[in-house]
């Protein structure tokens, strides 16, 4: 079983959308605002971001046995990042650069999370840490770190969906 209610996700659609997310996350990275990377310091601000780990059932065997565990983990991460992208970290000053695809990224995170959890089904979502940077440079730094961890997250999710589309599609 894959998603609540016992149905499988649309693996191919998920694969396409996760591939698009990879492209968007990669292209967004240099476009969150001008920043001096020497400022990059403490890691604590992004310690709480979701990671897909060994025990999450996202390996080929885990996906075959019961993909729900892995899909729930991916879903939690998508919601987590979607909330961050809609938060003051990205909407506050300094403004995003005009080329930034953050709106596309936000929409795609939402789109993929909806594919994984059709209306009426509810998985518990991870608490969003209260990151409210007061200084513009702190916001830039956080954007940079969030997008870097998002890149890693969607790269793993894309591999999961590629595997699912190839081996688990009905």
């Amino acid at each position: 079983r894959a998603v609540p209610g016992g149905s499988s996700p649309a693996w191919t659609q998920c694969q396409q959308l996760s591939q698009k997310l990879c492209t968007l996350a990669w292209s967004a990275h240099p476009l969150v605002g001008h920043m001096d990377l020497r400022e990059e310091g403490d890691e604590e601000t992004t310690n709480d971001v979701p990671h897909i780990q060994c025990g999450d059932g996202c390996d080929p065997q885990g996906l075959r046995d019961n993909s729900q565990f892995c899909l729930q983990r991916i879903h939690q991460g998508l919601i987590f990042y979607e909330k961050l992208l809609g938060s003051d970290i990205f909407t506050g000053e300094p403004s995003l650069l005009p080329d930034s695809p953050v709106g596309q990224l936000h929409a795609s995170l939402l789109g993929l999370s909806q594919l994984l959890q059709p209306e009426g089904h509810h998985w518990e979502t991870q608490q969003i840490p209260s990151l409210s940077p007061s200084q513009p440079w702190q916001r830039l730094l956080l954007r940079f770190k969030i997008l870097r961890s998002l890149q890693a997250f969607v790269a793993v999710a894309a591999r999961v969906f590629a595997h699912g589309a190839a081996t688990l599609s009905p």
Partner: antibody, heavy 116, light 107 residues
């Protein structure tokens, strides 16, 4: 500075095909999306699709699937749009533009007239 | 697809006047909305993005506001170079869609 230079006006026959080019300069071509848009005389703007030259990912507006094909040549920093089976409905100005969703940089437009 | 409804379709005003153009999205687009100006025979030019951020080089008499589904573009103290067509466009997902435009001409 960022520039997008499009190929010149085209007069083509119904049923034929056409390639419009958009040469980018002044920035890293592989790092930004190139969008294509259509504007018929006196009308609004329609989004055709985008290409990301960094990995050649493309996405099309459903309405233009089968009509437009987007490609990019990273060696010449040029994005192309191929239009097939042209009819009078395809007569329009076609623009390329750079952006992630909003479009801060535009080509000058290519006027395409389809006429027997 | 998200539909963008712009009003008014046309607008006549004099130099020095203040005008407001509105745009409604058929669903929530957060603050992912852009405004463009287009002169006859030219390419559109980005004025405002993310609903309220002025693009580089755009005079401060232009201002954008709104979020969710309701947006507006205000032009204070119209200048001769402001006459032309204005379009709104959402940039929340694809396909990108535009309003039908507002033609602003000299009264």
């Amino acid at each position: 500075q960022v520039q997008l230079q499009q190929s010149g006006l085209e007069l083509v026959k119904p049923g034929s095909s056409l390639k419009i080019s958009c040469k980018a300069s002044g920035y890293s071509f592989t790092s930004f999306f190139i969008h294509w848009l259509k504007q018929r005389p006196g009308q609004g703007l329609e989004w055709i699709g985008w290409i990301f030259p960094g990995n050649h990912d493309v996405e099309y507006n459903e309405k233009f699937k089968g009509k437009a094909t987007l490609t990019a040549d990273t060696s010449s920093s040029t994005a192309d749009m191929h239009l097939s089976s042209l009819t009078s409905e395809d007569s329009a100005v076609y623009f390329c533009a750079r952006g992630g969703g909003n479009l801060p940089y535009w080509g000058q437009g290519t006027l395409v007239t389809v006429s027997a | 697809d998200i539909q963008m409804t712009q009003s008014p379709v046309s607008l006549s005003a004099s130099v020095g006047e203040t005008v407001t153009i509105t745009c409604r999205a058929s669903e929530n687009v957060y603050s992912y909305l852009a405004w463009y100006q287009q002169k006859q025979g030219k390419s559109p030019q980005l004025l405002v993005y993310n609903a309220k951020t002025l693009a580089e080089g755009v005079p401060s008499r232009f201002s954008g506001s709104g979020s969710g589904t309701q947006f507006s573009l205000k032009i204070n103290s119209l200048q001769p170079e402001d006459f032309g067509s204005y379009y709104c466009q959402h940039h929340f997902g694809t396909p990108l869609t535009f309003g039908a435009g507002t033609k602003l001409d000299l009264k």
